[in-house]
Interface confidence: low
């Protein structure tokens, strides 16, 4: 049996305005609202479960519901990546998978979802109230992140219902292109809606859903418009902090990396794009979309932005054996 905590992300509002508005003032807001609703805000869902048979074993599943191409997935714990979280795994559709202890196996489950098995004992072992976050970088939507954790009182022997707790961040830089106009429209819509102070503002009501189609619906257009402009971003405080991570794959042979176009997944390229890249110093690598940098055996510190990924010369799954362990 498993204990699960599933975290759906926010969804654009459904038109649910009550009361009457003058016809003149209604037309433009509805047009803009339609634009906001159909803008296709992507979603990220996170599901965390603890195996009853192995109390120190966690399975994290994350999925991306969007129309774009995924260019990178980063899984972290202890909080969102770049906000105190520690990277557990990085999955790139072309360059492959990297993982760090206590991650045991990271893998693609489908074209738009991944799973990560964690297990450990002692300092690096996850505990029940640890927060796990998944960040999907995609084209053209940008980066979207959601986090989830098991309820502190979870009993691994009992199956707990999924508990929605939306935690989402959008790196707006990646989505400001065409969306800029829509965002401006949403701002104007928000302005119009706020003028009607007689209208009560219902609260966000996340709905419990399955992992296949996680969805938290925002019933208040005004609040949802705010969410579209400045997506709520929260971190669950945890008393269980992961220890410094060592690389999970200290095997011989050079690790080398190549520069990666920000939107590589939109135009997939074969290894020819990086096969001839000069090999840097043995054992060193720099990783991923949030600019992680690491030396072999060291925990990757956080650095500035920049999308650089560094594949193992032996291929995308060289770091991932039959059980994801080397």
């Amino acid at each position: 049996m498993r204990t699960e905590a599933q975290v759906p992300a926010l969804q654009p509002p459904e038109p649910g305005l009550e009361g009457a508005m003058g016809h003149r003032t209604l037309v433009l807001p509805w047009v803009l609202l339609t634009l906001c609703v159909t803008a296709g805000t992507p979603e990220v869902w996170v599901q965390v479960r603890m195996e009853a048979t192995e109390l120190s074993s966690f399975t994290i599943r994350c999925g991306f519901l969007g129309s774009g191409s995924i260019s990178l997935v980063t899984v972290s714990w202890g909080g969102p990546n770049g906000a105190g979280g520690t990277t557990l795994a990085v999955l790139h559709p072309e360059r492959g998978i990297r993982q760090w202890a206590p991650a045991r196996q990271a893998r693609w489950e489908t074209q738009s979802s991944i799973s990560l098995i964690l297990e450990g004992s002692g300092a690096s072992s996850p505990c029940a109230n640890t927060t796990f976050c998944c960040k999907f970088a995609s084209f053209p939507e940008g980066s979207w992140e959601a986090c989830g954790s098991l309820p502190p009182s979870s009993d691994p022997g009992l199956s707990a219902p999924p508990t929605p707790a939306p935690i989402l961040r959008a790196d707006l830089a990646g989505i400001l292109g065409v969306s800029g106009v829509l965002l401006f429209g949403c701002v104007y819509l928000l302005h119009l809606l706020r003028r009607h102070k007689h209208r009560p503002a219902p609260r966000l009501q996340p709905s419990r859903t399955s992992p296949q189609a996680p969805r938290a619906r925002a019933w208040a257009p005004s609040q949802a418009s705010q969410a579209a402009l400045h997506v709520p971003y929260a971190t669950i405080n945890t008393s269980c902090r992961p220890a410094t991570l060592d690389t999970a794959h200290p095997h011989g042979g050079p690790s080398w990396w190549a520069s990666l176009p920000t939107h590589a997944a939109h135009r997939p390229q074969g290894p020819a794009a990086w096969a001839s890249t000069p090999i840097p110093a043995r054992g060193s690598f720099v990783s991923v979309e949030n600019g992680l940098y690491a030396q072999a055996g060291e925990r990757p510190p956080h650095t500035g932005p920049g999308l650089t990924l560094f594949p193992d010369p032996r291929g995308p799954r060289a770091m991932e054996g039959p059980l994801g362990v080397r």
Epitope: T110, Q111, R267, A272, A275, R314, G315, P316, A318, P322
Partner: antibody, heavy 122, light 107 residues
């Protein structure tokens, strides 16, 4: 059960165009990538490339760039292989194959269509 | 491109025998190697994925091993339905390549 059903045999002349279909059933079409594999008479298997059924982005092996095109009809769970300006050396059996798991360097082709035999002859 | 060499090209066996088919890669491919069986006028069927992982519905007499550049498919106690072509395929890098195949035939 999971099935990939391909269109029937084709007889074409050089210079013509052919479009082979592959209809998937028994699973969510957009969950798994779709590869295309060529097998010339009495020969081995050659990977032509694949299409991401989620994003619709195709990727072609070097030998199959130019005259070959992968496409989708997602609503009907169909994948298509179109070959333009047919040549005699295109005579082969073409297979569609579902990919598992997904990553652009995809790997395991766990379900295959029955194959479509294309004969190009003047 | 990564070249996969299968040997022997043809293997003649008697039902009940156990056989090993070899696949050698021209460069390191970790465990990114898969085995397929293809009978005459049929489509290939996945037997083993990632060098040694079994596939649901495939008889347990099929097993795989190896890593890096040398791989083996073993068929314990061959049955008549096992005769046909066997291909290995790598997914370590583009383009995916298949071995030339080993024909398993009745002696």
């Amino acid at each position: 059960q999971i099935q990939l059903v391909q269109s029937g045999p084709e007889l074409k002349k050089p210079g013509e165009t052919v479009k082979i279909s592959c209809k998937a059933s028994g699973y969510t079409f957009t969950t798994y990538g779709m590869s295309w594999v060529k097998q010339a008479p009495g020969k081995g298997l050659k990977w032509m490339g694949w299409i991401n059924t989620y994003s619709g982005v195709p990727t072609y092996a070097d030998d199959f760039k130019g005259r070959f095109a992968f496409s989708l009809e997602t609503s009907a769970s169909n994948a298509y292989l179109q070959i333009n300006n047919l040549k005699n050396e295109d005579t082969a059996t073409y297979f569609c194959a579902r990919e598992l798991p997904f990553t652009t360097i995809i790997g395991t082709k766990d379900y295959w269509g029955q194959g479509t035999t294309l004969t190009v002859s003047s | 491109d990564i070249v996969l060499i299968q040997s022997p090209a043809t293997l003649s066996v008697t039902p009940g025998d156990s056989v090993s088919l070899s696949c050698r890669a021209s460069q390191f491919i970790s465990n990114n190697l898969h085995w397929y069986q293809q009978k005459s006028h049929e489509s290939p069927r996945l037997l083993i994925k990632y060098a040694s992982q079994s596939i649901s519905g495939i008889p347990s007499r099929f097993s795989g091993g190896g890593s890096g550049t040398d791989f083996t498919l073993t068929v314990n106690s061959v049955e008549t339905e096992d005769f046909g072509m066997y291909f290995c395929q790598q997914s370590n890098s583009w383009p995916h390549t298949f071995g030339g195949g080993t024909k398993l035939e009745i002696k």
